[in-house]
Amino acid sequence: AFGISGVQKYTRALHDSSITGISPITEYLASLSTYNDQSITFALEDESYEIYVEDLKKDEKKDKVLLSYYESQHPSNESGDGVDGKMLMVTLSPTKDFWLHANNKEHSVELHKCEKPLPDQAFFVLHNMHSNCVSFECKTDPGVFIGVKDNHLALIKVDSSENLCTENILFKLSET
């Protein structure tokens, strides 16, 4: 991997960025696990989905998530109207019509049923991290990443570049 990109310090939020195409550039079905190899699982409870971070029993099947990749313009921080290159954004869908959403008020990660076009809360900047890991930065809240807290997914504020290697915001994607 290229290593770790630093924390987005721009005053202009990532939600000023524009998704170049309405349709994804590619899609990828993968299981999602933490840096410490705990699995991210999804369970239907009382007509809504809950997200868990847990150790699976041997031979227990991992839940899969559909990652849809989008190309996006990255807003320039210094020239108000400039565009500063390209980024890759993803949406994550564990089951039909449900997507991971960033709830910035509650600092939580939730599964919401919604129709396309998806809201900005469903988009995450994908970071290519060291040790074959990735991280997911909220489009709507730069510097805030999906992370693990108390065996659940939560939104975690990363306040400096050095903290980007914190294990609780690192995830592994695998086809198996």
Partner: antibody, heavy 119, light 111 residues
């Protein structure tokens, strides 16, 4: 405007040392992974080294490991390449490059600085 | 390390013609469902310029006549109709893993 300006190149004898600098402007420097890529005269491109945005990780091509050190000073918006025990085969134009936001590819390149290793 | 082989070494064409450049990797450059293969253009005395990232996506400000395709180990850069400013050297590069490697380049020259 995003800009990378390299300096510090020149003529040096085999076994000598040189420190290259890259001054960055027009973007939040600390937010990006930075690299050095070189090109020998009339030849192709070769990746040399990368440093992550948090200074947490560095990677090098095998041929320079133990001789070259990549570093950065985010307060000065500067990238460096300390080159020791230089060899004739290190003669090249050295480009400073910035990854895209998210670290997937080399997106921005400087104009380069020429390093000549010769007796 | 992943070795990238470009062909042909030189392509002699006239303005307005279609250019097709090939890049073959010694192993798959796919990671996380992405083909991490990029294309750069370099003119004499200038630094390289990003044309295509992740196999098929144009960099900022790159004209629509440039397109990329392919997956796994075989990739193609196509210039649909050559403009005078397109005569240059083109490099493919993989960003799947360290060491990041480049192809040896294809020179597109005026016939």
């Amino acid at each position: 405007e995003v800009q990378l300006v390299e300096s510090g190149g020149g003529l040096v004898k085999p076994g000598g040392s040189l420190r290259l600098s890259c001054a960055a402007s027009g973007f939040t420097f600390s937010s990006f992974s930075m690299s050095w890529v070189r090109q020998a005269p009339g030849k192709g491109l070769e990746w040399v080294a990368t440093i992550s945005g948090g200074k947490t990780f560095t990677d090098y091509v095998d041929s320079v490991k133990g001789r070259f050190t990549i570093s950065r000073d985010d307060a000065k918006n500067s990238l460096y390449l300390q080159m020791n025990s230089l060899r004739a085969e290190d003669t090249a134009v050295y480009y400073c490059t910035r990854a895209n936001y998210g670290d997937w590819f080399f997106e921005v390149w400087g104009q380069g600085t020429l390093v000549t290793v010769s007796s | 390390e992943i070795v990238l082989t470009q062909s042909p070494a030189t392509l002699s064409l006239s303005p307005g013609e279609r250019a097709t450049l090939s890049c073959r990797a010694s192993e798959s450059v796919a990671k996380y469902g992405l083909s991490l293969l990029n294309w750069f253009q370099q003119k004499p005395g200038q630094p390289p310029r990003l044309l295509i990232f992740a196999a098929s996506n144009r960099g900022s400000g790159i004209p629509a006549r440039f397109s990329g395709s392919g997956s796994g180990t075989d990739f193609t850069l196509t210039i649909s109709s050559l403009e005078p400013e397109d005569f240059a050297v083109y490099y493919c590069q993989q960003s799947k893993e360290v060491p990041f490697t480049f192809g040896q380049g294809t020179k597109v020259e005026i016939k």
